[in-house]
């Protein structure tokens, strides 16, 4: 019925508008509706204009695709001509009243079927039903597999290929591990697979700048080191370096009015020369403070070295030695004054004696037959040395003495000349200034070491050697080497070190043989204003330790092997170092930073006196330790 209607309409159109010309009302009668008439009539007029007599040639040259008026007019009502739908995507085109409808093939959408439906993004069929890759194509889609997989017969699912089974030699000497879609050639940690040689090669991590400062590569690994001597330690990431930080601040205030007598480990701290009228007599007044028991305070001599006077400390008491053409004497007396308090000392040459007073009270009177120093040419010329004497004097002393004295003097008045000129000299030199407050002990400032020669061999014992160490420590930084035994070949067969613990505000103590930690005492609160007492006993068979928290004998699988290394070193010659290490490689020990803080050391029952060391860094204080810095209200 519908096609009959169309045929009737076509006949009417032919009769009314092609065989004859029609106006809009006549056209309305053909279509019997406004939308089609409104669509048809302007296009009908275009056809008429194109095919009027005389314009045919021009029309043929124009864009009009129709050969004659009939074709031109007949095509107007057909919305599907020319085809408005996308050829690839449409199934059919339906002509409507001044409109068209494109019916799309599956996989296409849009008014003209111009858009491909992305089946891969269909929420009702996730990923197009593909197990791996969904490839959208115009009007369709297909599934594919990733590398290392094969497609199953259902054309949707993928199966892994086991390359290790297919080619057993695929990894050479490395281990082949099959993984989904691929395989891996596995090497032990610290090794990298070489595709060319099909083998595992050591990774040189050091060439990859893994470490901030020093790096040591070894097969299968690497270790980072930091320059402890410059105040660095290894950070927790075991790669970067950080400054060894202060955990217990000390009061390091000094005053230039206080002369430090232990500025040099060996040598005089100050030398003065006096030229006075011949009637002058020797006199020295000063306040003196020390915890040291022995050492030279002052040495005075005549210009020709023929007469001399030594004011020293022995056993904590004042000792005077003198020698001139008339006499040679040594006297010790008075109370013990190495008590850390300021003591006023005066030594005055009287007509027939030398008077020594402490706190203005006479403690010694030494008779003398004549003047101490002989004047020449009407002048008394005297040389005065503080905290030492010229080297040649050592052999002339009535009784030998260790000249090193860790102490301070203030308010000095020599030869009744006051402090004339001395303060100005001291003021310029910071290292001649004394600490304002000190306590008993030895202080390691974190910049140097002391060396001792100790014989650890015990002939009477079956063990052959033993090291019994007692440490009383009050560290100021949480990292540093406290004690080390160093072999001639620059290895460190035994060391006791301090390291900051991973747990906050506590420290670990490491016992190491060469660069291996044999024992770690964890999380001790050592950075406090109280001293901590530690004891270690080691021989070729055993290692015992005692800390504030426990006493134990250490034994583990590897210990005997490490003790054997130590035993071998101890049978040769070892040097003992306190406060750090000499110039050994960074990698010689787990810790290489200098110890910073107070420490007193007893080895095999002998209290070590830093004044007796073979060598000692000038900044180490043998018998004085700075006080803990106390926060005041206005600081």
């Amino acid at each position: 019925a519908n096609s009959l209607l169309e045929e009737t309409k076509q006949g009417n159109l032919e009769r009314e508008c092609i065989e004859e010309l029609c106006n809009k009302e006549e056209a309305r009668e053909v279509f019997e509706n406004d939308p089609e008439t409104d669509y048809f009539y302007p296009k009908y007029l275009v056809c008429l204009r194109s095919f009027q007599t005389g314009l045919f040639t021009a029309a043929r040259q124009s864009t009009n695709a129709y050969p004659d008026l009939r074709s031109c007019v007949n095509a107007i009502p057909d919305q599907c001509s020319p085809l408005p739908c996308n050829e690839d995507g449409y199934m059919s085109c339906k002509d409507g009243k001044a409109s068209f409808t494109c019916t799309c093939k599956p996989g296409w959408q849009g008014e003209k079927c111009e858009f491909d439906i992305n089946e891969c993004k269909d929420p009702s069929n996730i990923n197009g039903g593909c197990s791996q890759i969904c490839d959208n194509t115009p009007g369709s889609y297909h599934c594919s597999c990733k590398n290392g997989f094969v497609m199953l017969s259902n054309k949707k699912d993928c199966k892994d290929v086991d390359e290790c089974s297919l080619k057993p030699s695929i990894c050479g000497t490395a281990v082949c591990k099959n993984i989904p879609g691929d395989f891996e050639c596995e090497c032990p940690e610290g090794y990298r697979y070489n595709l060319k040689s099909k083998s595992c090669e050591d990774i040189d991590e050091c060439s990859e700048n893994m470490c901030a400062q020093l790096c040591v590569n070894y097969p299968g690994g690497y270790t980072c080191y930091c320059d402890g001597k410059k105040g660095f330690k290894l950070a927790q990431d075991q790669k970067s370096c950080e400054v060894v930080s202060v955990c217990l601040p000390l009061n390091l205030d000094t005053k230039y009015e206080l002369l430090y007598l232990a500025e040099q480990f060996a040598g005089v701290v100050l030398y003065l020369k006096f030229r006075l009228p011949e009637i002058s007599r020797f006199s020295a007044e000063f306040d003196f403070r020390t915890y040291d028991s022995e050492g030279v305070i002052l040495y005075a001599e005549s210009i020709d070295h023929s007469a001399w006077l030594l004011i020293a400390l022995r056993g904590g008491k004042i000792e005077v030695q003198l020698k001139n053409e008339h006499t040679s004497k040594i006297t010790t007396g008075g109370d013990v004054i190495n008590n850390g308090l300021w003591n006023m000392v005066s030594v005055e040459e009287l007509e027939h004696s030398i008077s020594i007073k402490i706190a203005k009270e006479a403690v010694m009177d030494i008779n003398k037959p004549g003047p101490l120093f002989k004047p020449e040419n009407g002048l008394l010329e005297t040389k005065v040395y503080f905290a030492g004497f010229p080297r040649k004097v050592e052999s002339e002393l009535i009784k030998p003495i260790n000249p090193r004295l860790d102490g301070c003097i203030r308010s000095w008045n020599l030869m009744k000349q006051g402090a004339s000129g001395i303060k100005e000299i001291i003021q310029e030199k910071q290292n001649k200034h004394c600490l304002v407050t000190v306590e008993k002990g030895s202080y390691y400032p974190g910049s140097g070491i002391a060396q001792f020669h100790i014989d650890y061999n015990n002939v009477s014992s079956a063990e052959g050697w033993h090291v019994n160490v007692t440490l009383n420590i009050r560290p100021s930084t949480g990292t540093g080497v406290m004690l080390a035994l160093v072999s001639g070949n620059n290895t460190v067969p035994f060391a006791v070190s301090l390291v900051d613990s991973t747990s906050e505000k506590s420290q670990d103590i490491l016992l190491s043989v060469e660069n291996t930690v044999i024992y770690r005492i964890q999380a001790l609160s050592l950075c406090s204003d109280q001293q901590s007492h530690l004891e270690f006993r080691v021989n070729r068979n055993n290692l015992e330790l005692s800390t504030p928290l426990k006493i134990e004998t250490i034994s583990h699988e590897d210990l005997q092997r490490q003790l054997a290394v130590l035993d071998k070193a101890m049978k040769a010659k070892v040097a003992t170092y306190l406060g750090g290490l000499p110039d050994v490689p960074f990698s010689a020990t787990p810790v290489n930073a200098f110890y910073n803080g107070c420490m007193e050391v007893n080895i095999n029952g002998v209290q070590l006196d830093l004044d007796e060391a073979i060598s000692k860094h000038n900044d180490i204080r043998a018998h004085s330790c700075p006080s803990v810095w106390k926060k005041t209200k206005n600081s």
Epitope: E87, D116, K121, T137
Partner: antibody, heavy 120, light 110 residues
């Protein structure tokens, strides 16, 4: 990475024909599913879709411009072109070429645009 | 006169969220899921930010999201950043098989 670059005269006289070419690099103009489009932006910042073409030659035009516009494709040079006849000052705009996705009227890659001024 | 209506300008402070609306008719925005959003920094090529109303192309931050209700589509930008300052255009397919754009909204990050 697909890149598009417009080229052509920046000044066209009224009633003459505006001709622009878009060169595609980093991808083929014959890639399945992609249509190649022209869009313009008037000085007042409004965007206007002109039309698009498939490499086979199928074209879709904005009905308001259909009588004046022709988009063609040159597959060998990896280019497509725009011709707009009988231009007026109202056709002054920044003309962009762009790639249209197969799955919708979405333009995922655009050229930088070229300003065409219609003036005598 | 653009077929789709957008506010001329929107603004927000860094870290805030803003929404740009795009209103059309049942013949465009309301009739299809073919709605997209473009970001345009002046002097640069426009960039497709959202398609199919709410889908994001790869490489576009998840701070950008799209939605639609009736004849109005919306673009929301959360955690606003200085680099988001640009012109934003919405676009829709129409019943007459054409593509129409909004007039553009200038986003200012205060």
């Amino acid at each position: 990475q697909v890149q598009l670059q417009e080229s052509g005269p920046g000044l066209v006289k009224p009633s003459q024909t505006l001709s622009l070419t878009c060169t595609v690099s980093g991808g083929s103009i014959t890639s399945d599913g992609y249509h190649w489009s022209w869009i313009r932006q008037y000085p007042g910042k409004g965007l206007d879709w002109i039309g698009y073409i498939y490499y086979t030659g199928n074209t879709y035009y904005n009905p308001s411009l259909k009588s004046r516009v022709t988009i063609s494709v040159g597959t060998s040079q990896n280019q497509f072109s725009l011709k707009l006849i009988s231009v007026t000052a109202a056709d002054t705009a920044v003309y962009y070429c762009a790639r249209r996705l197969s799955t919708g009227p979405y333009f995922d890659y655009w050229g930088q645009g070229t300003l065409v001024t219609v003036s005598s | 006169q653009s077929a789709l209506t957008q506010p001329a300008s929107v603004s927000g402070s860094p870290g805030q969220s803003i929404t740009i609306s795009c209103t059309g008719t049942s013949s465009d925005v309301g009739g299809y899921e073919f709605v997209s959003w473009y970001q345009h920094h002046p002097g640069k090529a426009p960039k497709l930010m959202i398609y199919d109303v709410s889908s994001r192309p790869s490489g576009v931050s998840n701070r950008f999201s799209g939605s639609k209700s009736g004849n109005t589509a919306s673009l929301t930008i959360s955690g606003l950043q200085a680099e988001d300052e640009a012109d934003y255009y919405c676009s829709s397919y129409t019943r007459s098989s054409t593509v129409v754009f909004g007039g553009g909204a200038r986003l200012t990050v205060l």
